[in-house]
Interface confidence: low
């Protein structure tokens, strides 16, 4: 999906009002310095691409993020403010339902959510320009 035509300001508002708090809740009990940020993004469409990948794609050691509150709110924000996004996610959602049955918070998941926090912060920087 090409995130170029999303309403970035609306997504930013959704992040600031709710998603950021849900990410903090998920990470509660971990030190802010515990994980190094190794994932980066260059502009807002790039950031959303990486955010979508980390939030919804299953990875080794962490297959449970999609059902978290921050993930559901992220999905809603992208569906509302990115034209045509929800249509591209129908097959992915069905696959997700089959693949994710248990909800376990692993260290890998905590690290992954820490990366997400970094990506969201970069998405929200006012100096960040669209290409």
């Amino acid at each position: 999906y090409d995130f170029t035509n999303c309403d970035f300001e609306k997504i930013k508002a959704a992040y600031l009002s709710t998603i950021s708090k849900d990410l903090i809740t998920y990470m509660s009990g971990t030190k802010s310095t515990e994980f190094n940020n190794t994932v980066s993004c260059s502009n807002r469409p790039h950031c959303l691409t990486e955010i979508q990948s980390l939030t919804f794609n299953p990875t080794a050691g962490c297959a449970s993020l999609a059902k978290e509150m921050f993930a559901m709110k992220t999905k809603a924000a992208l569906a509302i403010w990115c034209p045509g996004y929800s249509e591209t996610q129908i097959n992915a959602t069905q696959a997700m339902k089959k693949a994710r049955k248990s909800k376990v918070t692993t260290n890998k998941c905590l690290e992954q959510v820490s990366q997400l926090q970094g990506l969201w912060r970069r998405f929200n920087r006012p100096l960040l320009k669209q290409q």
């Epitope: 260059s42 790039h46 990948s53 960040l128």
Partner: antibody
């Protein structure tokens, strides 16, 4: 045309200082992470330092930490490398490079022509 | 720190013949996001390096399809299906999984 042009190289004595500059054009400079890479005469490539697009994160190789400072001015489309306490082993061609962004995984997709720094007495 | 090791050091190839360069990392370059942070560059004689392949197997813009990258985890390969005269130079692999980023020592490719 996407272009990176380095300047500021030259001959300097051990212990001396030099400031390298890189002028970027043909792309939205503020969207990209930037990196300095060097190559000693007849040797391979060595990563020196990287700076993220909004200067939020800065990284250095151990060999230059505490002596070199990377900085950028997004308003002027310029990247700099301040080199202090220079040593003979810092002699190299220094390349200004562009990080390819999230899709390219931090690979360096644009390189300048390079500028020679010679540290010798 | 991650150490990158390339083999062979040099390679002499007949035009039209295939060539293969190996790159090994001291630890896995696979990130939890599913991407593997390994890239290939070519430095032609007297020129600056240029990006050939990023994230193991993706050809950079303008790179001919005779170049291909493969591998996973710690073992990677750059293949040239049919070497041409313009392919001479030194090939480098690089990891950007974590700082300090690091390059392999290089493989010099020349024409027989």
């Amino acid at each position: 045309e996407v272009q990176l042009v380095e300047s500021g190289g030259g001959l300097v004595q051990p212990g001396g200082s030099l400031r390298l500059s890189c002028a970027a054009s043909g792309f939205t400079f503020s969207n990209y992470d930037m990196t300095w890479v060097r190559q000693a005469p007849g040797k391979g490539l060595e990563w020196v330092s990287s700076i993220t697009f909004a200067s939020s994160y800065i990284y250095y190789a151990d060999s230059v930490k505490g002596r070199f400072t990377i900085s950028r001015d997004n308003a002027k489309n310029s990247l700099s490398l301040q080199m202090n306490s220079l040593r003979a082993e810092d002699t190299a061609v220094y390349y200004c490079t562009r990080g390819g962004g999230a899709y390219h995984g931090g690979s360096l997709d644009v390189w300048g022509q390079g500028v020679l720094v010679t540290v010798s007495s | 720190d991650i150490v990158m090791t390339q083999t062979p050091l040099s390679l002499s190839v007949t035009p039209g013949e295939p060539a293969s360069i190996s790159c090994r990392s001291s630890q896995s370059l696979l990130h939890i996001n599913g991407y593997t942070y390994l890239h290939w560059y070519l430095q032609k004689p007297g020129q600056s390096p240029q990006l050939l392949i990023y994230l193991v197997s993706h050809r950079a813009s303008g790179v001919p399809d005779r170049f291909s990258g493969s591998g996973s985890d710690t073992d990677f390969t750059l293949k040239i299906s049919r070497v041409e005269a313009e392919d001479v130079g030194v090939y480098y692999c690089e990891q950007t999984l974590q700082t300090p980023y690091s390059f392999g020592g290089g493989t010099k490719v020349e024409i027989k």
